[in-house]
């Protein structure tokens, strides 16, 4: 299937360019979303061009300023959060950012009524978290490593936590680990659905092995970075939660809510909090092990002002097959009966699909169900259910929005976003009002992005938020490459793959082939979305090739194809690259003496292997912070994927996996690698371990490090990258300049 | 109208066997949960067990389980009950019942049948 | 397996009186409950389901409340029609057991 068809009409060719390096750099193609800030059912905020903070009325048509860009300019603000009673608004400015979610930032109070910002008593700086109650204006507040509430914004701040130490004890905020592997978010509070309570994590870090790592800075000295980071089977952080009542927080203070037995009896983490009422509190734990998860919902006894989590509402699932969910274990969505709930896991045929929960999981009732995968349950309402699949024709790569009509028996199904804009969008996202009285579609492709409000109840369109038409206007004169998606059948595994081909293709000729791999568990690199970026480029200006596969060990095609990699990190990952390759050979227009393969992170870890595999298929390769060694990265990641690197679990392959173990193979290719000095996530120990493998096995090769630059390589360093890796590939694939 | 009408209940020797049948009208079988409920003389109503409307799922009180089958045919509108090995306290007015779906995934018995009577004795 | 206790087995009142009857679960069976009418010699009625919301056609001097493992039936200004036996039944968990049930005679 063409996803994007070739621009070029001959009358125009002469007007036509290709795609330029500069261009991907400046962002010349880059294209807009917009996903409603909605504060109602049917009232959202939106930022205007110019910079004033807009209040939209669906039902009145009706919209007006509710903060002007002049009042955001007069504190630098960046960005802004009204309060639920729109009293108040906070303005965030002096952002600084942290690691990938986490940043901290000054923050100010203006107050709508008198147009005034609060004075007396004034937020702390820096602050780490700040946000609102659900309800009212309270606001909860991290700074320092402790939880602070204010009943208002001009009160003096009731401190919640005394402990809060850097590096030591964290509240309310995750460490590095959580951050990164776990939450996903900056923050680790929620305000119970009415604000009466406060939930909070603590994390104590105390006994965890810190990296260390220079960062050098403009002084005389480099500063030295210190980082709390778990790496496999170290000590991990230890964590426990608190609720504690924000209308008299000072009477019985914080309660620690209870862990469930099994999962208390060794090492665990916390995965999730979910707020049922405002008495009633939802937690997910992970044994370290994470293969059982437990689901726990706990009450708030009022007599006794504690919380409590009967083991009649305990709910386990467990893999037998893998580690329990996909990338995380799935956070409930609970009905309108507040006990009952809706989940993603995987059904008895392997595939990820909703179940409804009531009593127990044994009991479960399923409500999709084919060989395809559920992927977001995105709102539950008195009469449906709304969620994603990649069910439609049969492509993984897909994501359509369904609903389900769950207040009449049969349930019906409904894809809402099939047949849209069937050639354009294939890829959705969606984002709902209270009470899903409207929603927004986000569509990513394959073709334009384009964004679009709709009704919740009959699903019209109501009107384009956003189509990208300067983007639109911008490619009519470029000559974008040709993609395609589409399957190779390997030993009963389906290999899904995009070709970006050159926009003059010709099967008859031979071509330089490009493998960019990420590969990682759960991951998907074969997706219906817009992309002009640096392989679009490689393919317009260049005549490259490049190929994206999804092999074992990716997600959306069901447990058999995820768990196929489980322990077993760095093996089928490549195979399957290498598969491709040569199927990819097979099809006649590949020059097999100009094959390259790149990718960052798990995706340098696998261009690694597959260019030390010893098949001869690679001419050259690139790895942009590879990961070398699985015993150097994360626990909560690592550990999920591998179990632990001891004797008796699965110390042999974390040996075996490594890639310093081939460093004699990486003697007939030509390998670039690449590496931020300060990289907090994937360590720069992981590149200078390879490096020094291979000088020690005298093998050649090139490198590159990015002084003071984290894993995303940002900025200036940017630019130097893709600079440094063109001429790399060019010079491999014998291309002038 | 809607209608369920019991038929099959009789006189039945210890460890014997016998089949009951609901024959219903007036609404869409096909999409309705269906339970057996029975009235021993002079006492309380009994769970016996249900069937969702597609058969999928059939769920029974722990102690009939091993003895008792519900089934269903939703081309006939009839709903059946398989009683296998019955003893003297398995006498009783037997009901079928018929569920309108509540949300969220559950069912009401909003309607009853007048019931029919087993008697087992030798 | 969860009981369902109900409370009181009988008790007899007057035309135009108040009566409760209340329904005790062995576990926590989260508003998950039926109450259903029988008079002699008939099948049973749904009054009540999801603890406190009333079926077609039941009149209003009927109500349901609880929550837990405690719920009650309420009958305001009992009418004649209103005798006979009656019973609750939790839909929590299968099997959906009933209470013993309680007989409302007339005084």
């Known amino acids: 299937i063409v996803l994007r068809p070739p621009r070029v009409h001959n009358s125009e060719e002469n007007t036509m360019r290709a795609l330029t390096l500069k261009d991907i750099l400046n962002g010349t193609f880059s294209y807009k979303t917009f996903f409603p800030n909605w504060i109602s059912g049917q009232e959202y905020l939106h930022q205007s061009a110019d910079n004033n903070i807009v209040l939209y009325n669906i039902e009145t048509g009706q919209s007006y300023t509710i903060l002007s860009n002049r009042t955001m300019k007069s504190v630098n603000a960046s960005n802004y959060g009204l309060s639920p009673d729109r009293q108040f608004v906070y303005l965030e400015s002096d952002y600084s950012k942290l690691w990938r979610y986490s940043y901290t930032a000054t923050y100010y109070i203006y107050d709508l009524s008198n147009g005034e910002f609060v004075r007396g008593n004034e937020l702390p700086r820096p602050i780490q978290y700040l946000c609102w109650s659900p309800v009212g204006s309270k606001l909860a507040y991290v700074y320092q490593n402790n939880i602070y509430l204010k009943q208002r914004p001009g009160d003096p701040p009731f401190q919640i936590t005394f402990n809060g130490r850097e590096n030591k004890i964290f509240n309310g905020i995750p460490d590095w680990v959580y951050e990164e592997e776990m939450l996903a978010t900056k923050y680790a509070l929620w305000w119970s659905p009415n604000g009466k309570f406060l939930a909070y994590a603590e994390f104590n870090d105390t006994d965890i092995p810190v990296i260390a790592y220079s960062y050098y800075g403009d002084e005389q000295y480099p500063r030295t970075i210190n980082i709390p980071y778990p790496k496999a089977g170290a000590k991990n952080p230890f964590v426990r939660i608190f609720i504690i009542d924000t209308t008299y927080p000072a009477y019985v203070g914080p309660q620690e809510v209870p862990v469930p037995a099994m999962i208390a009896s060794s090492d665990y983490y916390f995965s999730w909090l979910t707020w049922v009422t405002d008495e009633r509190v939802c937690l997910q734990w992970l044994k370290r092990v994470q293969n059982v998860s437990v689901l726990s919902i706990c009450d708030f006894r009022e007599d006794w002002q504690t919380w409590d989590c009967p083991k009649t509402q305990e709910h386990i699932e467990e893999s037998r097959t893998g580690w329990a969910g996909g990338f995380f274990v799935s956070t409930p969505v609970f009905s309108y009966d507040a006990i009952s709930y809706y989940k993603i896991f995987s059904d008895k045929d392997g595939y990820k699909h909703i179940h409804y929960i009531k009593d127990t999981v044994e009991n479960a009732i399923q409500i999709t169900s084919g060989k395809w995968e559920a992927i977001n349950i995105f709102r539950v309402t008195q009469d449906s259910l709304f969620y994603s699949s990649n069910e439609f024709e049969d492509y993984p790569g897909r994501r359509n929005i369904y609903r389900i009509s769950i207040g009449s028996y049969p349930p019906s199904k409904k894809c809402v976003t099939c047949h849209l804009r069937k050639e354009r969008c294939q890829y959705y996202t969606a984002s709902f009002s209270d009470y899903a009285k409207y929603y927004a579609l986000v569509c990513y492709g394959p073709g334009i992005p384009i964004s679009t409000l709709h009704d919740g109840r009959t699903d019209q369109e109501i009107k384009i938020l956003e189509e990208n038409k300067e983007l639109e206007n911008a490619l009519k004169n470029i000559q974008l490459p040709k993609e395609e998606i589409k399957k190779l059948e390997v030993d009963e595994i389906t290999l899904w793959y995009k070709m970006i081909l050159p926009p003059q293709f010709d099967r008859s000729k031979k071509y330089p082939l490009l493998i960019q791999v990420y590969g990682g568990p759960c991951s998907q690199s074969v997706r219906s979305v817009f992309a002009v970026n640096w392989i679009s480029y490689l393919a317009s200006k260049e005549g490259m090739v490049i190929a994206l596969v999804d092999g074992r060990g990716t997600a959306f095609q069901g447990d058999k194809l995820l768990y196929a990699v489980y322990r077993k990190l760095g093996v089928y990952e490549v195979e399957d690259q290498i598969t491709a390759v040569r199927k990819f050979i097979e099809m006649g227009f590949i020059d097999e003496k100009r094959i390259a393969i790149w990718g960052w992170s798990y995706g340098g870890y696998v261009s690694s292997l597959a260019l030390a595999s010893g098949t001869g298929l690679f001419k050259c390769g690139i790895a942009v912070a590879p990961v070398s060694s699985w015993e150097y990265y994360a626990s909560v990641y690592t550990e999920r994927f591998m179990g632990l690197p001891t004797k008796d679990d699965n110390l042999e392959h974390y040996k075996n996996s490594t890639v310093m173990a081939r460093a004699e193979y990486f003697r007939n290719v030509d390998y670039l690698l690449i590496h931020g000095t300060a990289d907090d996530n994937v360590h720069f120990q992981n590149s200078a371990q390879i490096a020094k493998a291979l000088v020690n096995a005298q093998v050649d090769f090139q490198a590159m490090w990015y002084s003071d630059q984290n894993h995303g390589l940002s900025g200036l360093s940017t630019n130097h990258l893709y600079t440094h890796m063109t001429h790399f590939l060019k010079q491999c694939f014998s291309l002038s300049d | 109208e809607v209608q369920l009408l019991e038929s099959g209940g009789g006189l039945v020797q210890p460890g014997g066997s016998l089949n009951l049948s609901c024959a219903a009208s007036?609404?869409?079988?096909?999409?309705?949960?269906m339970s057996w409920v029975r009235q021993a003389p002079g006492k309380g109503l009994e769970w016996i067990g249900e069937?969702?409307?597609?058969?999928?799922?059939?769920n029974y009180t722990p102690s009939l389980k091993d003895k008792f089958i519900i089934s269903r045919d939703n081309a006939k509108n009839t709903l059946y009950l398989q009683m296998n090995k019955v003893r003297s306290d398995d006498t009783a007015l037997y009901y079928c019942?018929?569920?309108?779906?509540?949300?969220?995934?559950?069912?009401?018995?909003?309607?009853w049948g007048q019931g029919t009577t087993v008697t087992v004795s030798s | 397996e969860l009981q369902m206790t109900q409370s009181p087995a009988s008790l007899s009142a007057s035309v135009g009186e108040t009566v409760t009857i209340t329904c005790r679960a062995s576990?926590?069976?989260?508003?998950?409950l039926a109450w259903y009418q029988q008079k002699q010699g008939k099948s049973p009625q749904l009054l009540v389901y999801?603890?406190?919301t009333l079926a077609d056609g039941v009149p209003s001097r009927f109500s349901g409340s609880g929550s837990g493992t405690q719920y009650s039936l309420k009958i305001n200004s009992l009418q004649p029609e209103d005798f006979g036996s009656y019973y609750c039944?939790?839909?929590?968990?299968?099997?959906?057991?009933f209470g013993g049930g309680t007989k409302l005679e007339i005084k």
């Open positions: 576990g926590n069976i989260h508003n998950y």
């Open positions: 039944q939790h839909f929590w968990s299968t099997p959906y057991t």
């Open positions: 019942a018929g569920g309108y779906y509540r949300y969220p995934y559950y069912y009401t018995m909003d309607y």
């Open positions: 007036g609404f869409d079988f096909s999409t309705y949960w």
């Open positions: 069937i969702n409307p597609d058969s999928s799922t059939i």
């Open positions: 999801n603890a406190k």
